[in-house]
């Protein structure tokens, strides 16, 4: 198909950064300022993305590639190609419709983005809580309570060696 297209389409060989100009008998013309074509054979150039407001320019637009945006400090990217900027919160908080709110008891968030998640339930794995959770940190699970009972040891001593012909006393 590609070979057929290239034989039939007089525009197929205009390089990236140009467009096939129907107003000039289908010769290749450079993309105008603030526009780009990232592939060859284009009949138009695309308008460059502008990083305004809460967006800032991470990579300038060129004749062959679009501008890339990220977010100003205090915000982070969401969506493909950083299509949105969302406000950062502190660790131990989550963003709600009313702004940043502290994590409820029993939940935590160790990042400036995302939602508060429940602490790990150590008992589900038969373990005990070694370090309590906070709004910013998950609990740390330790050994199971049985492993910590008096006299219990995680290492089993080797059986005593017996000489041949002797029965235990």
């Amino acid at each position: 198909f590609e070979r057929t297209r290239s034989l039939q389409d007089p525009c197929s060989n205009c390089p990236a950064g140009t467009f096939c100009d129907n107003n000039r008998n289908q010769i290749c013309s450079p993309c105008p300022p603030n526009s780009f074509s990232s592939a060859g054979g284009q009949r138009t150039c695309d308008i460059c993305r502008q990083c305004k407001g809460v967006f800032r320019t991470r990579k300038e637009c060129s004749s062959t590639s679009n501008a890339e945006c990220d977010c100003t400090p205090g915000f982070h990217c969401l969506g493909a190609g950083c299509s949105m900027c969302e406000q950062d919160c502190k660790q131990g908080q989550e963003l709600t419709k009313k702004g940043c709110k502290d994590c409820c008891f029993g939940t935590f968030n160790d990042q400036k983005r995302g939602i508060c998640r429940p602490w790990t339930n150590c008992s589900l794995d038969g373990k005990s809580v070694l370090v309590n959770g906070t709004k910013e940190r998950d609990v740390v699970c330790g050994p199971s309570p049985a492993d910590l009972s008096p006299g219990a040891s995680s290492v089993t001593p080797p059986a005593p060696a017996r000489e041949p012909g002797h029965s235990p006393q």
Partner: nanobody, 121 residues
């Protein structure tokens, strides 16, 4: 406005050489393919050679090994170096700006006015 101005034509003996030039203006020369065509008296215009922006070249079978097409993007000029000329090379030679930077089955968007090459003993 696109302009293509050929020069370098003239009379030459069989086996001789000539270099044709085509000075281009009014468009982005470096991103477009250019071609040479010729029209002998009483015959149809025919393809001779073409060169694309990336310098890939294509030649008509009748001129392969004898003619060389080249370009100087800094001077917006395309050249046709012709050697081992024969009587059947006698024609008006035209420079063409090709559509879509294509040298495979090319079609011409704009023509120059032509320059006459005569090969005779």
């Amino acid at each position: 406005e696109v302009q293509l101005v050929e020069s370098g034509g003239g009379e030459v003996q069989p086996g001789g050489s000539l270099r044709l030039s085509c000075a281009a203006s009014g468009f982005s020369f470096s991103i477009n393919a250019m071609g040479w065509y010729r029209q002998a008296p009483g015959k149809r215009r025919e393809f001779v050679a073409a060169i694309e922006s990336g310098r890939n070249t294509v030649y008509a079978e009748s001129v392969k090994g004898r003619f060389t097409i080249s370009r100087d993007n800094a001077k917006n000029t395309v050249y046709l170096q012709m050697s081992s000329l024969r009587a059947e090379d006698t024609a008006v030679y035209y420079c063409g700006l090709l559509k879509g930077n294509r040298v495979v089955s090319p079609s011409v968007a704009y023509w120059g006015q032509g320059t006459l090459v005569t090969v005779k003993p």
